[in-house]
């Protein structure tokens, strides 16, 4: 059986950012017709991963994997019917918990973001890394950068590659 | 709502292996009472990630995230009732597709492993990386090493930390 992953282009972009590979990021962003300001915004986030070194990429990869494979990303089956599940959680749409995490990473406070990551039983070192990254992003990105990052995320979520 | 991720200790070990950090791997393995031969087996796998450099870790992290967030890891809701889903896919058990991938990584041929990864619409560069890692593991690990890795996986899957 062929299986469709949830929003592959999102994970392509995430891993390109976390990897620190500018070429890989450019390739992924071209697929969703990113504007220059949107690219600039993503590269500022990428800079934070690069500055924090390899351990940062691995730990944040762990956060992403954990959230992506969490209970709530598997559908709130208790409150939904099978039909709802078919419609809502088995499509190629990105999981709401992942969306929320990314949203908080851009628009929330470091405390809010770390608190959300902490819900996933993350190790202290993972939480500390999340805080460092979040503070770095807040320092690097202007309000305009964050708006551009959010508009790019909209493009990603609504892309045929998602 | 507090959310329980699926088998956190498994992802701890996976990322420690892929990260190439021996200390982090030792810490994770201590939690599941790994024997010396089991540790040796995992370190041989880790060597393959280290030898293949950063890109290998990032690409394989992408494979793991993709499989973990795939349709089949979200439960075959179409064929199950909500009650079944509550019991079978919303627990802390590792997803069968992840289990199968890890099993093929250890006991299958490179062709089989790459074919399974390919089901998740992986990019050619991801597939080639998967093949390189798998061939490396086959070259490094003896029959005994693989048996020890499999016994460690059993410990992980049945651990209270899973």
């Amino acid at each position: 059986v062929k299986m469709a992953e949830t929003c592959p282009i999102f994970y392509d972009v995430f891993f390109a950012v976390a990897n620190g590979n500018e070429l890989l990021l450019d390739l992924s962003l071209t697929k969703v017709n990113a504007t220059e300001p949107e690219r600039t915004a993503m590269k500022k986030i990428q800079d934070c991963y690069v500055e924090n070194g390899l351990i940062s990429r691995v730990l944040d990869g762990l956060v992403m994997t954990t959230i992506s494979s969490s209970k709530d990303c598997m559908g709130e089956a208790v409150q939904n019917t099978v039909e709802d599940l078919k419609l809502n959680t088995l499509g190629r749409e990105i999981c709401p918990a992942v969306k929320r995490g990314v949203d908080l990473f851009l628009t929330g406070t470091p405390d809010e973001y770390v608190e959300q990551v902490a819900q996933y039983k993350a190790l202290p070192v993972v939480l500390e890394n999340a805080r460092i990254l979040k503070n770095c992003v807040d320092a690097k990105m202007t309000e305009e950068d964050k708006e551009n990052a959010l508009s790019l995320l909209d493009k990603i979520y609504t892309s045929p590659l998602c | 709502v507090k959310m329980a991720e699926t088998c956190p200790i498994f992802y701890d070990v996976f990322f420690a292996v892929a990260n190439g950090n021996e200390l982090l791997l030792d810490l994770s393995l201590t939690k599941v009472n790994a024997t010396e031969p089991e540790r040796t087996a995992m370190k041989k796998i880790q060597d393959c990630y280290v030898e293949n450099g950063l890109i290998s870790r990032v690409l394989d992290g992408l494979v793991m995230t993709t499989i973990s967030s795939s349709k089949d890891c979200m439960g075959e809701a179409v064929q199950n009732t909500v009650e079944d889903l509550k019991l079978n896919t919303l627990g802390r058990e590792i997803c069968p597709a992840v289990k199968r991938g890890v099993d093929l990584f250890l006991t299958g041929t490179p062709d089989e492993y790459v074919e399974q990864v390919a089901q998740y619409k992986a990019l050619p560069v991801v597939l080639e990386n998967a093949r390189i890692l798998k061939n490396c593991v086959d070259a490094k690990m003896t029959e005994e090493d693989k048996e020890n890795a499999l016994s460690l996986l059993d410990k992980i899957y049945t651990s209270p930390l899973c």
Epitope: - | G108, T109, P110, N135, E143, K146
Partner: antibody, heavy 120, light 106 residues
Framework: EVQLVESGGGLVKPGGSLRLSCAAS????????MNWIRQAPGKGLEWISY????????YYADSVKGRFTISRDNAKNSLYLQMNSLRAEDTAVYYC?????????????WGQGTLVTVSS | EIVMTQSPDFQSVAPKEKVTITCRAS??????LHWYQQKPDQSPKLLIK???QSFSGVPSRFSGSGSGTDFTLTINSLEAEDAATYYC????????FGQGTKVEIK
């Protein structure tokens, strides 16, 4: 002691069919991947197919794809090769070979081979 | 398809001399290269697995080296019983044999 004994070879006309068997003993057959390899008279070795231990995966060389089918019966400790639409160029000694457990090596033990001759 | 090219095709060597057989892959195959010996009217026997690992029971005069695309089988001090054809096999993607190298005792 590991033993692999091929049988079923013989003379067959072009376009005909033949089924080769390989009887395994001296090891837990169901734990091992198995291969068929052939050697045309006076020529080199050519890998043609392998099958996983649990019989759920098979792979073939392009030269035999669509004509040959590898299968196994773990209960009978037997490996098979069904050969259809045979051609003169399929004339060869056919060997079955075992892979190391958990794919730790390709072809660690071989049978003595069975000769297949395709001729009118 | 990965193509394996062995050289030379034929080698005539005096006893006690060193024999070197090379195998070249058409693409990088890591260490997924194995060496076999086939004596006349016998089935092949595994000598070296994964480029450099000796298979059990194989005399120590046989050794393998290389990785990526270039591999070597060395017989350090040739003995009369080593007269045979030697084949390399890649298992990186499916399986492919080299065309073989026949070693004759001078």
């Amino acid at each position: 002691e590991v033993q692999l004994v091929e049988s079923g070879g013989g003379l067959v006309k072009p376009g005909g069919s033949l089924r080769l068997s390989c009887a395994a003993s001296g090891f837990t057959f169901s734990d091992y991947y198995m291969n068929w390899i052939r050697q045309a008279p006076g020529k080199g070795l050519e890998w043609i197919s392998y099958i996983s231990s649990s019989d759920d995966t098979t792979y073939y060389a392009d030269s035999v794809k669509g004509r040959f089918t590898i299968s196994r019966d773990n209960a009978k400790n037997s490996l098979y090769l069904q050969m259809n639409s045979l051609r003169a160029e399929d004339t060869a000694v056919y060997y079955c070979a075992r892979d190391g457990k958990y794919n730790t090596v390709a072809g660690d033990h071989w049978g003595q081979g069975t000769l297949v001759t395709v001729s009118s | 398809e990965i193509v394996m090219t062995q050289s030379p095709d034929f080698q005539s060597v005096a006893p006690k001399e060193k024999v070197t057989i090379t195998c070249r892959a058409s693409q990088n195959i890591g260490s997924s290269l194995h060496w076999y010996q086939q004596k006349p009217d016998q089935s092949p026997k595994l000598l070296i697995k994964y480029a450099s690992q000796s298979f059990s029971g194989v005399p120590s005069r046989f050794s393998g080296s290389g990785s990526g695309t270039d591999f070597t089988l060395t017989i350090n001090s040739l003995e009369a019983e080593d007269a045979a054809t030697y084949y390399c096999l890649q298992s990186y993607t499916l399986r492919t044999f080299g065309q073989g190298t026949k070693v004759e005792i001078k």
